[in-house]
Amino acid sequence: ITQQDLAPQQRAAPQQKRSSPSEGLCPPGHHISEDGRDCISCKYGQDYSTHWNDLLFCLRCTRCDSGEVELSPCTTTRNTVCQCEEGTFREEDSPEMCRKCRTGCPRGMVKVGDCTPWSDIECVHKESGTKHSGEVPAVEETVTSSPGTPASPCS
């Protein structure tokens, strides 16, 4: 996932809707004006805000990377939702890229969990049932299986 246009955008264009802040805060889909007197709407498809806020600029929409699919577009109140393509996943500790799921488990292990957009296949030892930490096995050790189909979006 990448951020759009890292240079801050011009705001407060004449066509943007304005309203007054409530107790110093503007509603979702808006940001506060430079003098704090007005709420200015975010630009659809360009930026957004999700909560009541006193942000001087709306948050920039993210663009889905290649290797990701767009589940829902950016609106003025919600960021783009991106998900790894089928057969790939994004780990919590390396969220910057989608990684290919393993195609199978090492010998002596069985698959207990499919590839999803947010997790690799899960393998456990046949006897003990303990999880495999997960380096990609050598080809000759591999018992193959097809990647699972994404079941639901990860937010």
């Epitope: 996932i1 951020q3 890292l6 801050p8 506060i32 806020n53 006193d54 600029f57 920039r60």
Partner: nanobody, 128 residues
């Protein structure tokens, strides 16, 4: 608790330049997201510019773009506002400020109107 001490400011003719400084103490300067605001008599406090802790994300009010430059020196614990091509309407009390709860999204800093810690203010007067 962060403390901010401002210097610079004064009287200058239209078209002239001034540099404001804001020195911070009581906190790790390189972890502070900061900004400049100004308040003219009878007007609301208004955003001027903001800079992230790393200096990577910089924002300006539309009215000062191309004339003012915000910068920081993390080794010197100081933030600056270089003001060029000054206009009479730039006359105001200028305040530096710090955000104790900054907003980051996707690694990008976004400044808020309601910053938390304020400098003592410094007068800038631009005569025509």
């Amino acid at each position: 608790e962060v403390q901010l001490v401002q210097s610079g400011g004064g009287l200058v003719q239209a078209g002239g330049s001034l540099r404001l400084s804001c020195a911070a103490s009581g906190s790790t300067f390189s972890s502070l997201d900061m900004g400049w605001f100004r308040q003219a008599p009878g007007k609301e406090r208004a955003f001027v510019a903001a800079i992230s802790r790393s200096g990577d994300n910089i924002y300006y009010a539309e009215s000062v773009k191309g004339r003012f430059t915000i910068s920081r020196d993390n080794a010197e614990n100081t933030m600056y506002l270089q003001m060029n091509s000054l206009k009479p309407e730039d006359s105001a009390v200028y305040y530096c400020a710090v955000e104790s709860q900054p907003t980051y999204s996707g690694g990008v800093y976004y400044p808020r109107y309601g910053m938390d810690v304020w400098g003592q203010g410094t007068q800038v007067t631009v005569s025509s």
